[in-house]
């Protein structure tokens, strides 16, 4: 990667981070009456998530994420869940590259939507701070 492509990657990661934080804030909104119900849904967590290729694990969970977000009141988000997830999907596909043979491995334990989002927020923050 060139310095310009790395800069683009950084910007994409910042967009991904903002999108994930927006979803988390929308879910945690005290006016969200569906939070208890949303927390019953389980998400697969990556066995490891330190590099861009591990975004394969996030990509595979975007559809379930969209389904859970459809439960929330739309006013909690600036965009419809379908559009929000579509935006994230475009970023993820660009970031992880076209290494289609790379298979995700998941941790043994599942997580709530809040734990899931926090994991990928932590991932985004760490890549932003260490990518050179």
């Amino acid at each position: 990667p060139t310095s310009s492509s790395t800069k683009k990657t950084q910007l994409q990661l910042e967009h991904l981070l903002l999108d994930l934080q927006m979803i988390l804030n929308g879910i945690n909104n005290y006016k969200n009456p569906k939070l208890t119900r949303m927390l019953t849904f389980k998400f697969y967590m990556p066995k490891k998530a330190t590099e861009l290729k591990h975004l394969q694990c996030l990509e595979e969970e975007l559809k379930p994420l969209e389904e859970v977000l459809n439960l929330a009141q739309s006013k909690n988000f600036h965009l419809r869940p379908r559009d929000l997830i579509s935006n994230i999907n475009v970023i993820v596909l660009e970031l992880k590259g076209s290494e289609t043979t790379f298979m995700c491995e998941y941790a043994d334990e599942t997580a709530t939507i809040v734990e899931f989002l926090n994991r990928w927020i932590t991932f985004s923050q760490s890549i932003i701070s260490t990518l050179t």
Epitope: K53, E99, F123
Partner: antibody
């Protein structure tokens, strides 16, 4: 058998440069993330840099802007270009393979870098 | 950055003893923890990954446990070749960080 063999260490003056190499064999080099980890005399281990299979590079604040990790998949080789060296960079530098889903599973024997005037 | 606090920093024990080394992460790292053994003048050797799984060839007397922030490495019956320094490491997120090490000495 997985093997990692480092070379290129030596004595260098503060402000100087050095290029470390790591020759890998026994696995599909291009599919793995590789890392450099260092150990100052009598001290613990410190992660220095990593490069993934797409050649994206990662490093901590302590060396960013001074150290550059790179790889040559055709030669099964990993490199660490170290510039603006300081006394505190004195250490044994290890090359390690980062398994895709787990820890640093194989390590080289290390190469010693001494920064002193 | 995630801090890994290892204790004790040194430990004296005898052959046949059961020894436990602990590692505490400054934040949740799931089970993304590895343990390494390093003998004087040698490079680190990977013992444990995912907090509790032994690498191939690692004797069964070595075991790891824990998740979240608290982790342990146990050697059930010390052998002469086990006297070395042991390090924990988190690989939950970059930058990878290691514990300060535990030097296991012969009593």
């Amino acid at each position: 058998e997985v093997q990692l063999v480092e070379s290129g260490g030596g004595l260098v003056q503060p402000g100087g440069s050095l290029r470390l190499s790591c020759a890998a064999s026994g696995f599909t080099f291009s599919s793995y993330t590789l890392a450099w980890v260092r150990q100052a005399p009598g001290k613990g281990l410190e992660w220095v840099a990593a490069i993934d299979s797409s050649s994206y590079t990662y490093s901590p604040d302590t060396v960013r802007g001074r150290f550059t990790i790179s790889r040559d998949n055709a030669k099964n080789s990993l490199y660490l270009q170290m510039n603006s060296l300081r006394a505190e960079d004195t250490a044994v530098y290890y090359c390690a393979r980062d398994s895709n889903w787990d820890a640093l599973d194989y390590w080289g024997q290390g190469t010693t870098v001494t920064v002193s005037s | 950055d995630i801090q890994m606090t290892q204790s004790p920093s040194s430990l004296s024990a005898s052959v046949g003893d059961r020894v436990t080394i602990t590692c505490k992460a400054s934040q949740n790292v799931g089970t993304n923890v590895g343990w390494y053994q390093q003998k004087p003048g040698q490079s680190p050797k990977a013992l444990i990954y995912s907090a509790s799984f032994r690498y191939s060839g690692v004797p069964s007397r070595f075991s790891g446990s824990g998740s979240g922030t608290d982790f342990t490495l146990t050697i059930s019956s010390l052998q002469p070749e086990d006297f070395a320094t042991y390090y924990c490491q988190q690989y939950y997120t970059y930058p990878y960080t290691f514990g300060g090490g535990t030097k296991l000495e012969i009593k």
